[in-house]
């Protein structure tokens, strides 16, 4: 079975690498535009130059192309805590990231939010905070992990998952109560 190719891929595959087939004349292969530029006019004939123009401010192309328009630069999303790591240039999109001691959580492929790295209070750092992953904490005895924070077992309700981790404490509390009866 031949894999299905889109129209553009079909047209490009007829020409050597770095060239594309002229949309009005499939016997002509035009040179693609360099990154940082876009296609203003197709080449008029074989061996003749493609008319490529530089992207305007606020737009870019990151690879060789035959796009009729440059792509709009991304904006870092302040409401998601994002900060600009490097600004957009004609050949590279804006790079957004998080502040120091924060990590990225991807809600979807193209949307991330910055959150503070957990400090593991009442526990120890099992794995340090990374660019795309929060600190992994191990809690001290008498504490259990809830939403990546070490919470006292005194806050453990019987119906919660923490009962296994806090069982000795729960039994101790029960034992103390029992020993108080006469």
């Amino acid at each position: 079975l031949v894999p299905h190719l889109g129209d553009r891929e079909k047209r490009d595959s007829v020409c050597p690498q770095g060239k594309y087939i002229h949309p009005q004349n499939n016997s002509i292969c035009c040179t693609k535009c360099h990154k940082g530029t876009y296609l203003y006019n197709d080449c008029p004939g074989p061996g003749q130059d493609t008319d490529c123009r530089e992207c305007e401010s606020g737009s870019f192309t990151a690879s060789e192309n035959h796009l009729r328009h440059c792509l709009s630069c991304s904006k870092c999303r302040k409401e998601m805590g994002q900060v600009e790591i490097s600004s957009c240039t004609v050949d590279r999109d804006t790079v957004c990231g998080c502040r120091k001691n924060q990590y990225r959580h991807y809600w979807s492929e193209n949307l991330f939010q910055c959150f503070n790295c957990s400090l593991c209070l009442n526990g120890t750092v099992h794995l340090s905070c990374q660019e795309k992953q929060n600190t992994v904490c191990t809690c001290h005895a008498g504490f259990f992990l809830r939403e990546n924070e070490c919470v006292s077992c005194s806050n453990c309700k019987k119906s919660l998952e923490c009962t296994k981790l806090c069982l000795p404490q729960i039994e101790n509390v029960k034992g103390t109560e029992d020993s108080g009866t006469t």
């Epitope: 904006k75 999303r77 409401e79 959580h105 939010q113 959150f115």
Partner: nanobody, 119 residues
Framework: EVQLSESGGGLVQPGGSLRLSCAAS????????MVWVRQAPGKGLEWVSH????????FYADSVKGRFTISRDNSKNTLYLQMNSLRAEDTAVYYC????????????WGQGTLVTVSS
Amino acid sequence: EVQLSESGGGLVQPGGSLRLSCAASGFTFAHETMVWVRQAPGKGLEWVSHIPPDGQDPFYADSVKGRFTISRDNSKNTLYLQMNSLRAEDTAVYYCALLPNRGPWFDYWGQGTLVTVSS
């Protein structure tokens, strides 16, 4: 106490439209980024759209871009989702939520409203 209550769901034919609303109370609505997420039958939560407090530069998932419009009325403490050109794959329970700030989980979200797209 934070309360979020969605309405406007229902059965609609492919290509049809619906407008979802989310009434908010118990917090300063005008200061918060608001989110629409959805859960299709047997699937996980999907981020649909969000809108910052000032309503500028909303975000849309690629799957709904050009078809859905998020908006808000800060004077009415209400969030909206206008859904046009609906497809079968938009069938889901739609929830409004406050943008999380402590970690990647939703502390506050509504009970949801079911949108069914079927002929």
